[in-house]
């Protein structure tokens, strides 16, 4: 057959779905690879074809759309499972073509099992809530498009294994779960089970996400340099090892990049000829405030090195700070000679 | 004394008006702690008598008013059950005659004194007044270039000056003034604010535009690490893929075994009419086989390449 633009296996989209639940999977061509949408393609006379390769097989085979109760069907650019089975796991390909044009992409689909407490190998999205920040909500994710707005589903929320009922500060409100005042004790996995009717059958959608309570923006401060400070002087003799820790506290800030770096005489260590090594360690508090330590080390310091300016810099979305270390050459003790 | 120094704050302030600083450091002051203020490493705490010109009010240090001689380093000591932390506040007091000099002449103004209005929008300026509960603030008046602001485009609402349909003429030097009452005495607070105007970002065209690279070569030494950004502007609602390819294959797939050349994580900055995307390519170590090969940045239907070249020999 004529050449087809093959985008290969799109491993960026590791699609995981639960066994025995409906799943709707959009053809990634229109999401990530092509400039036009399905309607444009369809009206231009292009056809969307689906096929798959079973797990541990090399053979591409067409998808059977003639299963009882239309278990697998296609609607526009969506492949529907009503519901999934464990052996639906495999690589799925959608191909868009006419006589002169062809483009296709494959993606892996994994059908996973869950236990009665919703534990599974599913990768869980993480939703961060600010500590003691007032009312915050999480919304049951990825349920759009499963049922029309005229259908009113029932939604049950769980924390871990327990149904959320009469919890102190967590209130189910339909598709939303409200945290009146988020506390560390609210950390954990939350599951919404959406139950809806369709053509005389009842389907369940299970969605689990991890809630992580993090530092509040109300409490966020610019980076704080604990060390170096004005109270510690790094006094060394030439030939000794110079070790200066730069320890910086960063408040948790959503999507902020925390950076720490040293300059020596105003230059980055990479841009100067002296033999400097820098080791970094990072630790986090329970609310994801971060402490970064960068230890600047010069194995055999020279008297020239002891005259340089060593400045630790830190930056976050809250601002930039800098602090110079006090470095000086140790004055040798006077030597007395007996005449 | 076993106290841990945690940070130094620099404040530049105007003489002859009230000033207050609250000693808070969230990881520490959220618990049960006692706070004591000292001046210039003195062992004697700042007075807590409310009639004193400088006194501690709960966790605040309050100057009623600030005087030129008050410059210096103040320490606030936060003691917990089994912890002690110290914050240093370096206060620099200057004589500021609001209508004589431009606020632009002040050193290192904080963001509170430099604010932005967005052209064409209904926007606002904030008068930052940080004082303890014992201080009662009266209504705020706003000035621009020393004249009280009047006109239907401006409304004073609480600590804000609301500005309708911001124009380029709105840039300039503003001041907000409030009367502060403490223990029956009145003081004037006047904050200067330098206001700049941000322009609307214009963007035309619906095909992604690769700003960089521009189909050119880069001289790079053998064995070095190289990172090249691909910068793309595209419409907000685009569904275009942005990626680096070599020999018509995604670099991550092409170098799947060695992982020597990798595509970075895409980031973007959102503008009014468009997004600016950046996706980089990292050569952990440039090898001979990389020279002369076009590394293509793709963005939807747009492409641009870089070609690595050995630097010309230096015959000096």
């Amino acid at each position: 057959s004529e050449r087809c633009d093959d985008w290969g296996l799109d491993t960026m989209r590791q699609i995981q779905v639960f066994e025995d639940e409906p799943a709707r999977i959009k053809c990634p061509l229109f999401e990530h690879f092509l400039k036009f949408n399905y309607s444009t393609a369809h009206s231009a006379g292009l056809t969307l074809i689906w096929y798959w390769t079973r797990q541990d097989r090399d053979l591409e085979e067409p998808i059977n759309f003639r299963l009882p109760e239309n278990r697998i069907s296609k609607e526009k650019d969506v492949l529907w499972f009503r519901p999934t089975l464990l052996n639906d796991t495999g690589n799925y390909t959608c191909m868009l073509r006419n006589t002169t044009y062809c483009s296709k992409v494959a993606f892996p689909l994994e059908v996973v099992q869950k236990d009665s407490c919703f534990n599974s190998p599913m990768k869980l999205p993480v939703h961060k809530l600010y500590i003691e920040y007032g009312i915050q909500r999480i919304t049951c994710p990825n349920v759009d498009g499963y049922f029309p707005s005229s259908v009113k589903p029932t939604i049950t929320w769980y924390m871990g294994c327990y149904k959320i009922q009469n919890f102190n500060n967590v209130i189910p409100e339909g598709m939303n779960l409200s945290f009146l005042i988020a506390l560390i004790s609210n950390n954990g996995n939350y599951t919404c089970v959406v139950t809806y009717p369709e053509n005389g059958r009842t389907f369940h959608l299970t969605r689990t996400l991890t809630v992580k309570v993090v530092g509040s923006p109300k409490n966020a401060v610019p980076p704080v340099i604990h060390s170096p400070n004005d109270h510690v002087v790094y006094e060394k003799e030439p030939g000794e090892e110079l070790l200066i820790p730069c320890t910086v506290y960063f408040s948790f800030l959503m999507d902020s990049r925390n950076e720490v770096w040293w300059t020596i005489d105003g230059k980055k260590p990479d841009d100067i000829t002296i033999d400097v090594t820098i080791n970094e360690s990072i630790s986090h508090s329970r609310t994801e405030d971060e402490t970064r330590t960068q230890i600047l080390s010069i194995k055999k310091v020279t008297s020239e090195d002891l005259k340089r300016s060593y400045v630790c810099h830190a930056r976050s979305a809250k601002g930039e700070v800098a602090k110079a270390a006090k470095v000086k050459q140790k004055v040798p003790a006077p030597r007395y000679t007996v005449e | 004394d076993g106290c841990k120094d945690i940070f130094m704050k620099n404040e530049i302030l105007s003489a002859s008006q009230p000033f207050a600083f609250n000693c808070t450091f969230p990881p520490i002051t959220s618990g049960e702690v006692s706070v004591t203020w000292y001046k210039n490493s003195s062992k004697i705490p700042v007075s807590k008598i409310i009639q004193s010109r400088i006194h501690q009010d709960e966790t605040w240090i309050l100057f009623l008013p600030m005087e030129w001689g008050d410059s210096g380093v103040y320490q606030c000591v936060i003691k917990g059950r089994d912890s002690c932390h110290r914050i240093h506040v370096n206060l620099t007091v200057f004589e500021k005659h609001w209508c004589d000099t431009s606020i632009g002449g002040l050193p290192n103004l904080s963001d509170e004194y430099k604010q932005i209005l967005h052209l064409g929008k209904d926007d606002s300026l904030t008068c930052h007044l940080h004082f303890p509960k014992s201080c009662v603030l009266g209504p705020i008046k706003w000035y621009k270039d020393c004249n009280e602001i009047k006109g239907e485009r401006f409304t004073v609402l609480e600590t804000r000056l609301l500005v309708s349909n911001v124009s380029a003429e709105d840039r300039g030097n503003y001041a907000c003034q409030a009367i502060l009452t403490h223990s029956g005495k009145q003081y004037e607070v006047l904050n200067g604010i330098t206001v700049s105007i941000t322009e609307r970002a214009g963007y035309g065209g619906s095909v992604p535009k690769i700003i960089y690279p521009k189909n050119h070569s880069i001289e790079v030494q053998l064995g070095t690490t190289l990172i090249v950004d691909c910068n793309v502007t595209d419409t907000k609602d685009n569904t275009n893929l942005r990626c680096w390819r070599v020999n018509n294959t995604l670099v991550d797939d092409y170098y799947d075994e060695s992982k020597r050349i990798r595509e970075g994580v895409e980031t973007h900055v959102s503008f009014r009419e468009h997004n600016l995307y950046t996706v980089n390519i990292t050569f952990l170590e440039v090898k001979m086989e990389d020279y002369g090969l076009p590394f293509m940045c793709h963005a939807g239907v747009s492409t641009a390449y870089i070609i690595l070249q050995l630097p010309a020999p230096d015959f000096r």
Epitope: - | H118, G120, K121, D122, D123, S124, E152, R153, T155, L157, E158, R160, L162, S164, R272
Partner: antibody
Framework: EVQLVESGGGLVQPGRSLRLSCAAS????????IHWVRQAPGKGLEWVSV????????GYADSVKGRFTVSRDNAKNSLYLQMNSLRTEDTALYYC???????????WGQGTLVTVSS | EIVLTQSPATLSLSPGERATLSCRAS??????LAWYQQKPGQAPRLLIY???NRATDIPARFSGSGSGTDFTLTISSLEPEDFAVYYC?????????FGGGTKVEIK
């Protein structure tokens, strides 16, 4: 032509929640503050909430403070009002309105009716 | 909050007559006052803003005056489509407040 279209109203029991939406078109949505104003059946107008162009300034009437949350999505030209712990006295026609000179209202939607009743 | 009191509650007039509506504020609102017209089953419509400025497409028979605490909306010669409820609103302070309304009805 400037248009504001509210949706999401309906009958709800006291103590429950409702989320109203307002879809805007015909003007540069992210240049303006947008407000919610309500009108109880047969009664006058009551201002409910305001949100500035960049969500930096938000204001509420005392009667809804702590229960209602206003938000906006400039990318979608949409305004929202999340109403929790609803009371019978919240029964009203809810309008969204474009701010003019910040706090006057030069364009209004047709309103969405919220009925709180057991 | 600033309370706006409108008077009279109802005004019965014939087409062609002059209508004078009053709005009094419990404290000064400078000139930050607007007037709206509302017909049954419709959303309000901005008539006057900042006490005296006519909004876009508002006929010249509508005029506003006043500042501080006392404001007036005048309709110089009533047209049949002017019979409606009129509200004043202040933007001097949050919460924004409306008057209770004046109903202009056909005599």
């Amino acid at each position: 032509e400037v248009q504001l279209v509210e949706s999401g109203g309906g009958l709800v029991q006291p103590g429950r929640s409702l989320r109203l939406s307002c879809a805007a078109s015909g003007f540069t949505f992210d240049d303006y503050a947008i407000h919610w104003v309500r009108q109880a059946p047969g009664k006058g107008l009551e201002w409910v909430s305001v949100i500035s162009w960049n969500s930096d300034i938000i204001g509420y009437a005392d009667s809804v403070k702590g229960r209602f949350t206003v938000s906006r999505d400039n990318a979608k030209n949409s305004l929202y009002l999340q109403m929790n712990s609803l009371r019978t006295e919240d029964t009203a026609l809810y309008y969204c309105a474009k701010g003019y000179n910040w706090n006057f209202f030069d364009y209004w939607g047709q309103g969405t009716l919220v009925t709180v009743s057991s | 909050e600033i309370v706006l009191t409108q008077s009279p509650a109802t005004l019965s007039l014939s087409p062609g007559e002059r209508a004078t509506l009053s709005c009094r504020a419990s404290q000064s609102v400078s000139s930050y006052l607007a007037w709206y017209q509302q017909k049954p089953g419709q959303a309000p419509r901005l008539l006057i803003y900042n006490a005296a400025n006519r909004a876009t497409d508002i006929p010249a028979r509508f005029s506003g005056s006043g500042s501080g605490t006392d404001f007036t909306l005048t309709i110089s010669s009533l047209e049949p489509e002017d019979f409606a409820v009129y509200y004043c609103q202040q933007r001097s302070n949050w919460p924004l407040t409306f008057g209770g309304g004046t109903k202009v009805e056909i005599k």
